[in-house]
Interface confidence: low
């Protein structure tokens, strides 16, 4: 009975240096990504960033809130959490992609229209799990519905066709605050990842019973971080085998 | 508040013509596409025709084609239905109708309901 | 064409009731399906858009379902007020087309 005890005890504590191995391995590893990053970026030490700041750089939208709020989670969590070894789980990455300005996307008075996405390399079309097009959509005074509408530009065609449609959603809005509204935009996303030319952009339209557009696409006064943008989430299967 | 008052009906002997006038107020009038609707006397509601905005997209019933022309009035606030070779069965109170959207927006085939009528104006063909 | 066949043709209902109108589209029109009520002497009115969407100002006792091909209309308690017509209508295509209609009466 005795020597059970003590053969548990033996294997309990190999499992444990396991353990404090594999975890001081996996903290050298990120300590050193963490140089890599900070010398390409020719910083000395971490830019000390808030919260608050993050909040007033990125775009005030529910998918964003939820990731600073989760990141804060995990930050303040002590490290007695469960540790998941990574190299053996396909994780989900989210991307944001904010709106770049492009020569195809200009109307005839030289103002430019919204909006046009250029795509990290991450984002390839079979790992695509969700692609979302999120737009903020200004106050009414008095209730309406209002028309959404997400166009899809195309090279023009022989009938002088420029672009086709993405999304059309109608939606009742009272008078109060504004709204973010998300449209699913997976399917236009793994066509623009197989074909990168056909990506000439999309024109965002949002009106209400009298016709003003309620969509922000070029941010006015009082109007930052209000810009649309995609959310987009990707699967990274992993490479390695369990050894 | 969104109002149509439709004029013009009365009775006409067939083969005759007549203009039908729907004068809209209370909403940006160019915006919106319209539609002639009519119902027979104790009958059910038929679509006759649909105009977009501009005035430059305009469909038509089969039973009709041909004989109705739709147009409109930006400037004046007013759709109309021009009606040539009428016949017995052209009787029927005509509504003039605003679509629910505004037409800048392209809805890739389906047309969208409406969601103002005026009080329809009768029209009897009949010798 | 599209043809929308509704049923019934008619019904009596007393106040209170829950009434339940159907109409089917002869092919698939997703959801792009709305209802109208008609008083007599008047005319037609939109409560429902897009199947299942009510028209502002509408009463919530008033509602809409289905797509594809199958719809349904109901009103949860029928009131005086709701003694009308009733008619189903595409527009998935034109020529836009209506159903039949269903007469609504109090018992």
């Known amino acids: 009975n005795e020597n059970s005890e003590q053969k548990e005890n033996v294997e309990k504590e190999g499992l444990c240096n396991a353990c404090t191995w594999r975890q001081n391995t996996k903290s050298s590893r990120i300590e050193a990504i963490k140089i890599q990053i900070l010398s390409k970026l020719r910083l000395e030490t971490a830019p000390n960033i808030s919260k608050d700041v993050i909040r007033q750089l990125l775009p005030k939208a529910p998918p964003l809130r939820e990731l600073i709020d989760q990141y804060d989670v995990q930050r303040d969590d002590s490290s007695d959490g469960s540790l998941e070894d990574d190299d053996y789980h396909a994780t989900t990455e989210t991307i944001i992609t904010m709106p770049t300005e492009s020569d195809f996307l200009m109307q005839v008075d030289g103002k430019p229209k919204c909006c046009f996405f250029k795509f990290s390399s991450k984002i390839q079309y079979n790992k695509v799990v969700k692609a979302q097009l999120w737009i903020y959509l200004r106050p009414v005074e008095t209730p309406t519905t209002v028309f959404v509408q997400i166009l899809r530009l195309i090279k023009p065609m022989k009938d002088g066709t420029r672009y086709t449609g993405i999304r059309s959603l109608k939606l009742d809005m009272n008078p109060g605050t504004g709204i973010w509204q998300s449209i699913d935009v997976k399917t236009v996303l793994q066509n623009w990842l197989k074909q990168p030319e056909s990506n000439l952009g999309i024109e965002i339209k949002a009106l209400d019973e009298n016709g003003h557009d309620l969509a922000v696409t070029f941010p006015g006064p009082g109007e930052d971080g209000l810009n649309p943008f995609l959310e987009v989430k990707v699967t990274d299967t992993p490479k390695r085998s369990r050894r | 508040e969104v109002q149509l008052v439709e004029s013009g009906g009365g009775l006409v002997q067939p083969g005759g013509s007549l203009r039908l006038s729907c004068t809209a107020s209370?909403?940006?009038?160019?915006?919106?596409?319209m539609d002639w609707v009519r119902q027979a006397p104790g009958k059910g509601l038929e679509w006759v025709s649909y105009?977009?905005?501009?005035?430059?997209?305009?469909y038509y019933a089969d039973s009709v084609k041909g004989r109705f022309t739709i147009s409109r009035d930006n400037a004046k606030n007013t759709l109309y239905l021009q009606m040539n070779s009428l016949r017995a069965e052209d009787t029927a109170v005509y509504y003039c109708?605003?679509?629910?959207?505004?037409?800048?927006?392209?809805?890739?085939?389906?047309?969208?309901?409406?969601?103002?009528w005026g009080q329809g104006t009768l029209v009897t063909v009949s010798s | 064409d599209i043809q929308m066949t509704q049923s019934p043709s008619s019904l009596s209902a007393s106040v209170g009731d829950r009434v339940t109108i159907t109409c089917q589209a002869s092919?698939?029109?997703?959801?792009?399906l709305n209802w109208y009520q008609q008083k007599p002497g008047k005319a037609p009115k939109l409560l429902i858009y897009d199947a299942s969407n009510l028209q502002r100002g509408v009463p919530s006792r008033f509602s809409g379902s289905g797509s594809g091909t199958d719809f349904t209309f109901t009103i949860s308690s029928l009131q005086p007020e709701d003694i009308a017509t009733y008619y189903c209508?595409?527009?998935?295509?034109?020529?836009?087309?209506f159903g039949g209609g269903t007469k609504v009466e109090i018992k």
């Open positions: 209370g909403f940006t009038f160019g915006s919106y596409p």
């Open positions: 209508q595409q527009s998935a295509s034109t020529p836009i087309t």
């Open positions: 092919q698939v029109i997703k959801t792009w």
């Open positions: 109708a605003k679509v629910q959207s505004p037409s800048e927006l392209l809805w890739f085939g389906e047309l969208l309901p409406v969601d103002y």
């Open positions: 105009i977009s905005g501009r005035g430059d997209v305009t």
